[in-house]
C-alpha cells in the first residue's frame, strides 16, 4: 500500500474548461479565424460565439496552430476530451487527430507520447460528439497545448476539456541513472520508458517518468499492469555490477521549500531472479540549487525479508527535514534494484528567510501553506470513469 500516494484511477476530475473555473484569461491560442471563434470559445460543450476555437491558419501541412490552457498549478492530466464545432448543426469542422505538448514551467515544452512512442491522438469523427482520450502515460503539467492536425487542407475547430487532479507531491523532476536491461531467458527492459526529461552520459535529468506515474509494479517484474508492453515495463532497474560504489544515487527537485516526513519507494523483491529490496537508504537535503547539501544524511536501514518475494512499498522516514532538493542513495542488497514508484509526504514551508527565488512553476500570488488543506478535486464533481476496453483506454 502506497499510503498517501495518489491513485491515478481517481485522478480524473474535470479541470475547469466546461464549468469555467479556468478563466478566459488562462486560455490562449496561436491564432483565431475571427473573434467569434476565439480562444474563449474552446470550452467543451460550449455554444458561445460560433461554437468553437478555429485557427486562422491551415493545420496542413504544418501543424503549428495550437490552443493553450494554463492550469496555473501543476496538475496530473490523465484524460482529455475534444469536440468540433457543432453550432446547433451549422458547424461541420472538427479535428480527426491532434497532438499534445505540455510544460511545467512555460519554458521547456515536451511532446506527449503514448507508451509506444506515438504522438498522434485520434480525435473526432463528427462536429458534435465528445471523444475522450485516456493519456497513458499521464502528464504532469501546468500548461497544455492542443495541436489539431489534418491530412489535407481543410478547416478544423476544437473544443476541449482536461481531466486529472492537482499534483500534490510537488515533485518537479527526478534525476537517476538510465535503467538497464536484465538478461534472463527473455530480455527484461527496466528503462524509464516515459521519462520526459533529458538523457546524457548514463543519466536522466530534468524530467518525470514512470517512477512518478502512480502505477505500482506487480510481484513478478516481468509482468505488467499495462497491455501490449514489454517485460519489465512497470519497473526501472539497475544492476549492482554497474555501481561499484554499492548504491544508486537519485536526486529529487520540488516546487517549493518543503518539510519532508516520508519517502515511499515501491520495490520489487523477486530475489529468485536477482531483485532485492535496498539494504538501506541515505538522504540529504538542500534548500536551493547552488547551495551545499546540509548536515549529515538521514540513514534508514532496511532489514528486508529475503523469504517474501512480494513487491512492496518501503517507507523511509525523513524526519521533517526541510529542503527543495533531496539526494538519496539506495544501497544494493542483491544483484538488482527495481523500483516502480517513488512518492513523498511533505508540507510546504513558508520561510521568509529564503535566499533563493521561489521556483517559477508556481502561479502569481502566495502559495498555500499546507497541501493537506488543499482540495484535490473540484467540489461536487465525479471523476470520469475509465471504461474497460473502451477506445479511451
Amino acid at each position: 500500500d502506497m499510503k498517501g500516494h495518489f491513485d491515478p484511477a481517481k485522478c480524473r476530475y474535470a479541470l475547469g474548461m466546461q464549468d469555467r473555473t479556468i478563466p478566459d484569461s488562462d486560455i490562449s491560442v496561436s491564432s483565431s479565424w475571427s473573434d467569434s471563434t476565439a480562444a474563449r470559445h474552446s470550452r467543451l460543450e460550449s455554444s458561445d460565439g460560433d461554437g468553437a476555437w478555429c485557427p486562422a491558419g491551415p493545420v496542413f501541412p504544418k501543424e503549428e496552430e495550437y490552443l493553450q490552457v494554463d492550469l496555473r498549478r501543476l496538475h496530473l492530466v490523465a484524460l482529455v476530451g475534444t469536440q468540433g464545432r457543432h453550432a446547433g448543426g451549422l458547424g461541420k469542422e472538427f479535428s480527426r487527430s491532434y497532438r499534445l505538448r505540455y510544460s511545467r514551467d512555460g519554458r521547456r515544452w515536451m511532446d506527449w507520447k503514448d507508451r509506444w512512442g506515438q504522438e498522434v491522438i485520434s480525435g473526432n469523427e463528427d462536429p458534435g460528439g465528445v471523444v475522450l482520450k485516456d493519456l497513458g502515460p499521464p502528464m504532469v503539467a501546468r500548461l497544455v497545448r492542443f495541436y489539431p492536425r489534418a491530412d489535407r487542407v481543410m478547416s478544423v475547430c476544437l473544443r476541449v476539456e482536461l481531466y486529472g487532479c492537482l499534483w500534490r507531491d510537488g515533485l518537479l523532476s527526478y534525476t537517476a541513472p538510465v535503467g538497464q536491461t536484465m538478461q534472463l531467458s527473455e530480455m527484461v527492459y527496466l528503462n524509464d520508458s516515459t521519462y520526459d526529461g533529458y538523457t546524457a552520459g548514463g543519466l536522466q535529468y530534468g524530467g518525470l517518468g514512470q517512477l512518478a506515474d502512480g502505477v505500482v509494479g506487480l510481484d513478478d517484474f516481468r509482468q505488467s499492469q499495462e497491455l501490449r508492453v514489454w517485460p519489465g515495463y512497470d519497473y526501472v532497474g539497475w544492476s549492482n555490477h554497474s555501481f561499484p560504489s554499492g548504491y544508486v544515487e537519485m536526486e529529487f527537485e520540488f516546487d517549493r521549500l518543503r518539510s519532508f516526513q516520508t519517502m515511499q519507494v515501491h520495490c520489487n523483491n523477486m530475489h529468485t531472479l536477482g531483485a532485492r529490496l535496498p539494504g538501506g537508504v541515505e538522504c540529504r537535503f538542500k534548500r536551493g540549487p547552488a547551495m551545499a547539501w546540509e548536515g549529515e544524511p538521514v540513514h534508514h536501514a532496511l532489514g528486508g525479508s529475503l523469504g517474501d518475494p512480494r513487491a512492496r512499498a518501503i517507507s523511509v522516514p525523513l524526519g521533517g527535514h526541510v529542503g527543495r532538493f533531496l539526494q538519496c542513495r539506495f544501497l544494493f542488497a542483491g544483484p538488482w534494484l527495481l523500483f516502480s514508484e517513488i512518492s513523498f509526504i511533505s508540507d510546504v514551508v513558508n520561510d521568509s528567510s529564503d535566499t533563493f527565488p521561489p521556483a517559477p512553476w508556481w502561479p502569481p500570488g502566495p502559495p498555500p501553506t499546507n497541501f493537506s488543506s488543499l482540495e484535490l478535486e473540484p467540489r461536487g464533481q465525479q471523476p470520469v470513469a475509465k471504461a474497460e476496453g473502451s477506445p479511451t483506454a
Epitope: 548514463g202 543519466l203 544492476s239
Partner: antibody
Amino acid sequence: QVQLVESGGRVVQPGRSLRLSCTASGFSLNRYYMLWVRQAPGKGLEWIGTISYGDTTYYASWAKGRFTISRDNSKNTLYLQMNSLRAEDTAVYYCARADTGDNGYLGLQLWGQGTLVTVSS
Amino acid sequence: DIQMTQSPSSVSASVGDRVTITCQASQSIGSVLAWYQQKPGKAPKLLISGVFDLASGVPSRFSGSGSGTDFTLTISSLQPEDFATYYCQYIPYGSSPFGGGTKVEIK
C-alpha cells in the same frame, strides 16, 4: 559539431609534471562521465581514470596519487594533471565520453584524437 | 580491482571467415561490458555496449554474447575493413579496465 579535442602533449623530462586538456564542443562536459585512457606505443588501451557528472573521481590503482582528473565547467574543459612523470608514461592520451546504449549500459561513444606525451631526458 | 583478459592476443583470418574473440573478467560483471575496434593511428570506435547492444552504424555481422565472467565478440563474416585490434572493457559507473586487445590480421 560534437567533438573532443585534447591538447598539452609534448616532450617532458622524467620527474616533471604536465597538464593535459580536453575541450568539448557541442555538449556540456558536466553532464557526462568522462574518462582518460592512454595507449603506449605498440601497446593496448589503458584506463587511467573517470570523473562523474557529480565530480566523483575514480582512478586505476597505478594512477592514484600521481594523476588527477578535474574539469572547468565554465570552459567546458576536462584536465589530466600528471606528476612525477616516468618513461613508461610515454603514450597517446585520449579523453572519451561515456554514453548509454538502448539497454542502459555505458560505452565510450565519443573519443578525442589523442595527444602524445613523451617522457624522455 | 577487476581484471579483463582477452584471448587470443592475435588471430590470422581471411575475408569471409567467422572470427571469435573472448574476454574473461576476474569476477562477475553481469552485463557491464563494451567492445571497441581500433585501427592504427586512430581513436577506438565503440562497437557494442551491454554485451549485446550494437552501437549506431555498426554492421550486423558484429555480435556479442555472454554474461557474468565470460564474453564473446563474433564477426560472422570478416570484411576487409574489419582488420583491426579489438578491445573489451568493463565499464560501470566507476573503474573501467580494458582487456589486453586482440589483433585481427590478414592470413
